[in-house]
Amino acid sequence: LIQERRSHEVNPAAHLTGANSSLTGSGGPLLWETQLGLAFLRGLSYHDGALVVTKAGYYYIYSKVQLGGVGCPLGLASTITHGLYKRTPRYPEELELLVSQQSPCGRATSSSRVWWDSSFLGGVVHLEAGEEVVVRVLDERLVRLRDGTRSYFGAFMV
Amino acid sequence: LIQERRSHEVNPAAHLTGANSSLTGSGGPLLWETQLGLAFLRGLSYHDGALVVTKAGYYYIYSKVQLGGVGCPLGLASTITHGLYKRTPRYPEELELLVSQQSPCGRATSSSRVWWDSSFLGGVVHLEAGEEVVVRVLDERLVRLRDGTRSYFGAFMV
Amino acid sequence: LIQERRSHEVNPAAHLTGANSSLTGSGGPLLWETQLGLAFLRGLSYHDGALVVTKAGYYYIYSKVQLGGVGCPLGLASTITHGLYKRTPRYPEELELLVSQQSPCGRATSSSRVWWDSSFLGGVVHLEAGEEVVVRVLDERLVRLRDGTRSYFGAFMV
């Protein structure tokens, strides 16, 4: 998988930001803003929450999500899972790439205590043209959106 | 915003480290070491806590701060905000780029309990020549400096 | 330390993943998978837990470790230290590069409470050919390995 980066080519990169529509409650991946504010796509495409690779190579992919709450919602598991997942033409199911588990509710020592936590993931993965990367958070009820600076998703070729 | 990286040019990068002088208590941004130890500037400038862009493009910017304390200082808000902010000649106020909120004090179940926490931010943003990026932490009283390895600030063009 | 990236050269990069053999309990650094699954080496070498630099330059190095437990093991310090360290032929001891301290056990308000936490480190450092970078976690008893997606270690030249 030797890969070269030519000096006359634009290096693929993207930064997508959280928006009011990010949390669907449908069990699908988080959705993202691709154009407004800090968001952009350069040499990558976007579809329904997914960054779509148009040029094969090694990419540093990253995501941060802002978590927060008052105590813990009834029935909420003590673990929040935040992950980056790959969809590939060669396999029908999503593949885990980078994943974190956190127990942020444990910070609140009383049921009325406000708490905040943040989860950051980043790492280099090989992606082929046509493959897609998505962000998932379980349970997404604890994701706190505001202005695109606290929850985001991005990538660039290395 | 098409941007190319020429093979004969040095790719801008910097890594600045925390120092005793980083915390000013003045309400300004954190200050950083730019030369000693692990710190360096390559194709970027520095001024009063700010990384100053000399070449327009997309940059992966990042910062980590080490937080710690014994219980929680009286009157401290339950939220710590750690952020990267942009100053631009085109707008009078700082613009939020990447921000995290955390409630690390909630980890300490007694007022005499020692606790540590860390906040990491990183993401790709477009920066014009002359624009500046700074790091702010509110409340900075909980930032724990030591030797430049626990709190730092950096960037590189992607 | 002027460094250029030639368009005809492969840019050094690596992503190493956690495996059952990662935790040795010997006081040494964590060990990593270098070939299977998501793991790869491109223009970097590996030896006994260390990424070995074959081409001098500035590298963004990163590591994430997944922490977890049930309450806190007896005798466990309230602080977990996760760090990236450099070994150089020019100095007999390892040098700290990027370090985080966390107190994740403090999240569990009872001794039988399950908790999870994650620590991420990333930053740009200058590395010479022959120098090595390792990951250490103290106390490594709280590192939770699974499938290579939760604890990992990587680098790429910037």
């Epitope: 030797i2 030519r6 579809h47 997914a50 040029k55 969809r87 033409p89 029908p92 082929e128 | - | -």
Partner: antibody, heavy 116, light 107 residues
Framework: QVQLVESGGGLVKPGGSLRLSCAAS????????MSWIRQAPGKGLEWVSY???????YYSESVKGRFTISRDNAKNSLYLQMNSLRAEDTAVYYC??????????WGQGTLVTVSS | DIQMTQSPSSLSASVGDRVTITCRAS??????LAWFQQKPGKAPKSLIY???SLQSGVPSKFSGSGSGTDFTLTISSLQPEDFATYFC?????????FGPGTKVDIK
């Protein structure tokens, strides 16, 4: 075994429309990315469009804004709606399944002729 | 777009000959290269993917090699059923592009 059968080709005037279909069998259609490729008479091959499992869609510049790819997983079918047809769209159109590489399995093709 | 060129554009060979076709990409495509065989009036058939991996059911007389910009398809011992046109195709970068083809006919 994997089978892809195209239909819907024919003679159409410039500016006209056609809808091509590709009936798939022998595999779980919804699990796969699917493509359309065309070959002008006596010429080379050109990738026209693809649709991913999640319905991400890509078009070549030559057909963007005129052609629409779609899929019906319940019917194991792939479609290509072709509008504003031009003489240069005359070709044999193939559907193909993407697995180990983008065009692993091909149908037999259907001929589209655009002429006045 | 990445341009794919093939050489020769045509060649005449005899049964039993070893035949080599080359394909060159206008920029590096790693190993993201496929080879296809097409007979008159028929659909292309995939022979090789990832530059050197044989598709299931394809006889081992076909082999591929190369990486970066230069690739070859070799037929170790040409048989009557191998007289056809051969195309290379890159799938490193959108849009995926094909070579113009190499026609192999009987000497």
């Amino acid at each position: 075994q994997v089978q892809l059968v195209e239909s819907g080709g024919g003679l159409v005037k410039p500016g006209g429309s056609l809808r091509l279909s590709c009936a798939a069998s022998g595999f779980t259609f919804s699990d796969y990315y699917m493509s359309w490729i065309r070959q002008a008479p006596g010429k080379g091959l050109e990738w026209v469009s693809y649709i991913s499992r999640s319905s991400f869609i890509y078009y070549s510049e030559s057909v963007k804004g005129r052609f629409t790819i779609s899929r019906d997983n319940a019917k194991n079918s792939l479609y290509l709606q072709m509008n504003s047809l031009r003489a240069e769209d005359t070709a044999v159109y193939y559907c193909a399944r993407w697995e180990l590489s983008p065009f692993d399995y091909w149908g037999q093709g259907t001929l589209v002729t655009v002429s006045s | 777009d990445i341009q794919m060129t093939q050489s020769p554009s045509s060649l005449s060979a005899s049964v039993g000959d070893r035949v080599t076709i080359t394909c060159r990409a206008s920029q590096g495509i790693s190993n993201y290269l496929a080879w296809f065989q097409q007979k008159p009036g028929k659909a292309p058939k995939s022979l090789i993917y990832a530059a050197s991996s044989l598709q299931s059911g394809v006889p081992s007389k076909f082999s591929g090699s190369g990486s970066g910009t230069d690739f070859t398809l070799t037929i170790s011992s040409l048989q009557p059923e191998d007289f056809a046109t051969y195309f290379c195709q890159q799938y490193n970068t959108y849009p995926f592009t094909f070579g113009p083809g190499t026609k192999v006919d009987i000497k």
